[in-house]
């Protein structure tokens, strides 16, 4: 019996679902009544999920795991882990026992993208050349620990007088605060780059300091230019900041978040206090940061339906607003491949290869190619169906006439995440059955 798992770690984003792939080669005449399948944590041997006595024995791991029951008979022992947490990171062992037995371990690497950094200055008023300022770059809710780089407007690295701290919250996600102390020149740009080493994702922000300041009193509302990309099920921060006047107090502040198109109220702050969420109780402000001009909104457990533009309106004596776009995304699962017919295949037969990938958003781009990487465009039909949550299941069907042998690959691309999920099937010339028998 051969048990196969991917060599590379499975990288899963916090809050999303991950598939830990595991397959075995069933013998002819194999029935599920013969199968024992055990998933366990490699290090502690804690039971995660099991299949025995012809039935799924369920999750022993926080009720967040599932098998693919319809695929077990074909040798697919993969485990679906839902709503991935940082604490899930590590090695999982897939143990298969029929008459023969075998096991293999697959590594789960958990990741969470860092938010676009917010930059603050101290002091932030009446700055003059020669003043020493502290620039703080803060990026939130990432994993694993970030690498932080500072540079000036010419791209020259700034390494002196930098202090970086990273604190994990209860979920194990890191908030990064990096402090740069500089002496101001006539003017200057300072950039902070926060890198997620696993995702190879860079989040950067910069601040340009022109020492002579504009007149006080005018409110400036700032939001990120780029859409905020949030994964379904995770929390998103819609950044919004304003420049409080000297002597500003929260009693003077009106802050309103609303949907840009419908003007539906989302969250508000007035009369010196947070008036709470008017949006499914999934929003929150950062009350401790409001007095410093941070009007950002936290949107919890992001759904596809949340996608769109949110307006941040700030009114003190002066007033202003700005809109920030939320782009929702969900990674597509590794495609599963099926053949029809799947028995006694011979050169010259016409087969239908179906590539299925699940629970992604937005709609995927699907590409087929042969073993030489040549695109296959003829006789391809792709359908995408959204479920109640708005996530898409993709089914792409390729009809081909078998040659002596051939490899057919299907690539499912998430255009927002630039995430590619691929599956392939190799069909050999001799009469065969799919999946191959032991």
């Amino acid at each position: 019996l051969e048990v196969q798992v991917p060599e590379d770690p499975v990288v899963a984003l916090v809050g999303t679902d991950a598939t830990l792939c595991c397959s075995f080669s069933p013998e002819p005449g194999f029935s599920l009544a013969q199968l024992n399948l055990i998933w366990q944590l490699t290090d502690t041997k804690q039971l995660v999920h099991s299949f025995a006595e012809g039935q799924d024995q369920g999750s022993a791991y926080a009720n967040r795991t599932a098998l693919f029951p319809d695929l077990l008979a074909q040798g697919n022992a993969s485990l679906r882990l839902q709503r991935v947490r940082v604490a899930d990171e590590g090695s999982f062992t897939c143990f298969v026992s029929i008459r023969d037995f075998g096991s293999a371990a697959v590594s789960l690497q958990v990741a969470a993208p860092y938010s676009k950094p917010s930059m603050t200055l101290e002091p932030n008023k009446d700055l003059r050349p020669g003043d020493t300022v502290t620039i703080t770059c803060s990026s939130y809710q990432g994993y694993p620990e970030a690498e932080v780089f500072w540079q000036d407007g010419q791209g020259v690295p700034l390494t002196g007088n930098v202090t970086t701290s990273q604190m994990a919250n209860e979920q194990g996600l890191f908030d990064v605060h990096s402090i740069l102390r500089v002496v101001l020149g006539a003017n200057g740009t300072y950039s902070c780059l926060v890198r997620n080493p696993v995702l190879q994702q860079d989040a950067h922000s910069s601040v340009t300091i022109t020492p002579q300041r504009s007149p006080t009193g005018a409110v400036e509302v700032q939001v990120p230019e780029d859409p905020v990309v949030a994964l379904v099920g995770t929390d998103a921060t819609l950044r919004c900041s304003f420049s409080p006047e000297p002597g500003f107090s929260l009693a003077q502040l009106n802050l309103i978040w609303q949907l840009t198109d419908t003007k539906q109220l989302v969250h508000s702050f007035t009369e010196g206090r947070d008036q709470g969420s008017a949006y499914a109780n999934r929003t929150a402000l950062f009350p401790d940061l409001l007095a410093q001009g941070n009007a950002s909104l936290r949107l919890q457990r992001v759904r596809v339906a949340d996608e769109g533009s949110f307006t941040c309106f700030v009114s003190i004596r002066d007033f202003g607003s700005a809109a920030v776009s939320l782009q929702v995304a969900a990674p597509y699962s590794k495609p599963s491949m099926t053949l029809e017919p799947n028995k006694d295949l011979r050169p010259g037969d016409t087969v239908t290869i179906t590539c299925s990938s699940y629970r992604g958003y937005p709609e995927a781009e699907v590409f087929w190619q042969d073993g030489q990487g040549v695109p296959l465009t003829g006789n391809v039909t792709t359908s995408q169906m959204a479920n109640e949550q708005g996530l898409f299941d993709v089914h792409s069907v390729l009809r081909v006439v078998l040659g002596a042998n051939g490899t057919y690959s299907c690539l499912v691309r998430n255009p927002v995440l630039q995430q590619d999920a691929h599956g392939s099937v190799t069909i050999t010339g001799q009469p065969m059955t799919f999946p191959p028998e032991a």
Partner: antibody
Amino acid sequence: EVQLVESGGGLVKPGGSLRLSCAASGFTFSSYGMSWVRQAPGKGLEWVAAISGGGNYTYYLDSVKGRFTISRDNAKNSLYLQMNSLRAEDTAVYYCARQGLRVMDNWGQGTSVTVSS
Amino acid sequence: DIQMTQSPSSLSASVGDRVTITCRASENIYSNLAWYQQKPGKAPKLLVYAATNLADGVPSRFSGSGSGTQYSLTISSLQSEDFATYYCQHFWGIPPWTFGGGTKLEIK
């Protein structure tokens, strides 16, 4: 003492244009948002447009959006309302008002706009 | 957009009377409401801001009250100079910052 003085009103034909001005004095102009409010003959007050202190945020009544433009020149302590494609229903006295803490705490004396053929 | 419904639209009263004008907002405006007085041919004058605060120089016979969607302006003892038209206006959220339809207070 805060003073707001409107000018630029007059008689104009439908489809025509006018530019209203409001000269401000007695306060730090760039620190305050400003609004235009109008009042048709024998009718109530109607908020028309607002502009933030720095001039970077503007808001309009739906019925004037695309026809009217509010702007300001902080160096000249002046507020403007450019009115294009004027209609009979735009006939009104137009007031400029200073925005205090979510209130219009000072008003000009108004300038009259008549749109008629 | 938020609608402001002011009532009554007109009111006859005598010097010394106590009168109350009300304003209803179509949604919670969290006390972001002002009251103005306007006399014929003149610009409006601020009376009350933030629902309950009297503007500088406004006599104490004027008072504002209310919260949520319901607000009122009360004149405790009418004086001859109080006969005018009164308007409420909300300042909640992104404009338009609409006015109520006005209440004309006339001498009985």
